[in-house]
């Protein structure tokens, strides 16, 4: 019968020919006139046989990532009779892996959004690299992830590529971060190949800022002839948050005379001071009221940032009008 060994060829061999192995029949004692033949895809081109000895050589550089095995057929003929010595047999030449492919991040670009002030350990995103080398061949495709840029705010789990928060971040100080992740094969050992990817991490706003009045005192005037409902001036607060978290409501905190009201312009986020009752210069020529401002939407969990509302004092002077 055929005497079989496993046939392997390392990929990317630079030699002009590489000895793969030898076809042999156990009937071949060296004194026979046995001629070995190689058939199938790759025979005569990729693989050449010395028909006199059965020695098979690879004469082309092979790429395992392109083709990992070749199925060939062997024949052996006794040239004295012209007959087959053994039945034709199929066998495999495997292309063995070398570490010739670097890890690649296939899902680039990576972008993630995470709420500001998220606690340490919060999962941001998972990045995954692929390595075309053989995962069953040593460590050629075993990857380790590391952080090249992004400390101290982020960390990456070495084996999973999961990026987590390692330090709280304030969107109002910096609203986005570029993190650079490296994947190394050979589990980072010498001779490892690497690939990198960038991750844009944006911080989404949480309502961690209360609105604060720009001025602690506003001076307004109102004519004694002004009808009720007249807008006599505006006040304004600022909020470092954005969007819904910066929406605010103004209100009167103190107005003993109950003469004034404040309504909120939700487009401009201003407070409009309105005359609720007519005023009379001769009766009272000035008023002092206190206004307060609060966010429109406050999450229960963020109440600690909103315990005391910002207030401002408004002095209103009544203008005299000549009466007939």
């Amino acid at each position: 019968g055929w005497v079989w060994n496993q046939f392997f060829v390392p990929e990317e061999m630079n030699t002009t020919s590489h000895h793969v192995g030898r076809l042999r029949s156990d009937l071949d004692n060296g004194n026979n006139s046995f001629q070995y033949k190689l058939l199938g895809a790759g025979a005569g081109s990729t693989f050449i046989i010395d028909e006199r000895t059965g020695d098979i050589y690879a004469i082309e550089k092979l790429d395992r990532e392109e083709r990992s095995l070749y199925i060939l057929r062997a024949q052996v003929i006794d040239i004295t009779t012209g007959r087959a010595v053994e039945p034709e047999s199929e066998f495999v030449i495997k292309v063995s892996d070398i570490n010739d492919n670097e890890p690649k991040f296939l899902d680039e670009p990576y972008e993630a959004i995470v709420p500001e002030m998220s606690p340490e350990g919060t999962l941001v995103i998972q990045v995954t690299a692929s390595d075309a080398d053989d995962p069953s061949s040593g460590n050629n495709a075993r990857l380790l992830y590391s952080l090249l840029q992004g400390q101290p705010y982020f960390s990456v789990e070495p084996t999973t590529g999961v990026i987590r928060i390692s330090s709280k971040m304030d969107r109002e100080l910096q609203d986005e971060y570029w993190v650079i992740i490296q994947a190394k094969d050979m589990i980072g050992q010498p001779g490892a190949l690497s690939g990198t990817t960038s991750v844009l991490i944006k911080l989404s706003d949480v309502n961690d800022n209360k609105p604060i009045f720009k001025e602690s005192l506003y001076r307004l005037t109102v004519s004694e002839s002004a009808p009720t409902g007249t807008s006599i001036g505006t006040i304004m607060a600022y909020d470092n948050d954005i969007g819904e978290n910066a929406e605010m409501d103004y209100s009167i905190e103190e107005d003993d005379s109950q003469t004034f009201d404040i309504i909120t312009n939700h487009e401009t986020q201003e407070g409009i001071v309105i005359l609720k009752k007519k005023v009379n210069f001769e009766h009272q020529n000035h008023y002092g009221i206190r206004a307060k401002v609060k966010n429109h939407h406050v999450d229960e969990q963020l109440m600690k940032y909103h315990t005391e509302a910002s207030t401002t004092f408004i002095k209103i002077q009544v203008e005299d009008v000549d009466e007939p």
Epitope: S33, Q35, D50, E51, R52, I79, T80
Partner: antibody, heavy 120, light 108 residues
Framework: QVQLQESGPGLVKPSETLSLTCTVS????????WSWIRQPPGKGLEWIGY???????NYNPSLKSRVTMSIDTSKNQFSLTLSSLTAADTAVYFC??????????????WGQGTLVTVSS | EIVLTQSPGTLSLSPGERATLSCRAS???????LAWYQQKPGQAPRLLIF???SRATGIPDRFSGSGSGTDFTLTISGLEPEDFAVYHC?????????FGGGTKVEIK
């Protein structure tokens, strides 16, 4: 047409190693078997062995332990190394082309031969 | 290995005569894988016959080969002056390849 030319030392000391080179011109070394044959003075021819262009070799069992052959397809050359020389290795050494793929064939063409004398 | 015995060792003939050279193998030579060569002093052998009976390119038809199995013959029908040389047989049906000891054809 294909021509072969042997080159190497004419005189070698006993116990030393002989190195000969055969240069092929007028055709490619690839695709063929290449043999070395020797002829002691006044005697018959002896096949030493062959090398295939891919590097596969087969040597005469009588010399196998002392013979090494190599091939350089880029230079269109093949070589013979014979170690532990004695006076019995004194001969004219020929290189010749065997067939292309397949079973053994006759030798054609031949180099003109080079005389190697083993003497101290 | 197959041992080839050539006879006679020397053949003395005159130009124009017929020469018959014998090559006997110690065992059957596969598929008549036998060649004949001519060698002149100081020269390399020159292929005459292969496959026991096929003439090589450029070989005159006065040279012919025959035989099979273990007995092979080279015949030169009418010797020309340039034919006086040593003739070798060689088998290539089995490894190692072997040559006969040679037959010298000399002028009588």
């Amino acid at each position: 047409q294909v021509q072969l030319q042997e080159s190497g030392p004419g005189l070698v000391k006993p116990s030393e190693t002989l190195s000969l080179t055969c240069t092929v011109s007028g055709g490619s070394i690839s695709g063929y078997y290449w043999s070395w044959i020797r002829q002691p003075p006044g005697k018959g021819l002896e096949w030493i062995g062959y090398i295939y262009y891919i590097g596969s070799t087969n040597y005469n069992p009588s010399l196998k332990s002392r013979v090494t052959m190599s091939i350089d397809t880029s230079k269109n050359q093949f070589s013979l190394t014979l170690s532990s020389l004695t006076a019995a290795d004194t001969a004219v050494y020929f290189c010749a082309r065997d067939g292309s793929s397949g079973w053994y064939r006759w030798f054609d063409p031949w180099g003109q031969g080079t005389l190697v004398t083993v003497s101290s | 290995e197959i041992v080839l015995t050539q006879s006679p060792g020397t053949l003395s003939l005159s130009p124009g005569e017929r020469a018959t050279l014998s090559c006997r193998a110690s065992q059957s030579v596969s598929s008549s894988y036998l060649a004949w060569y001519q060698q002149k002093p100081g020269q390399a052998p020159r292929l005459l016959i292969f496959g026991a009976s096929s003439r090589a390119t450029g070989i005159p038809d006065r040279f012919s080969g025959s035989g099979s199995g273990t007995d092979f013959t080279l015949t030169i029908s009418g010797l020309e002056p340039e034919d006086f040389a040593v003739y070798h047989c060689q088998q290539y049906g089995n490894s190692p390849l072997t040559f006969g000891g040679g037959t010298k054809v000399e002028i009588k």
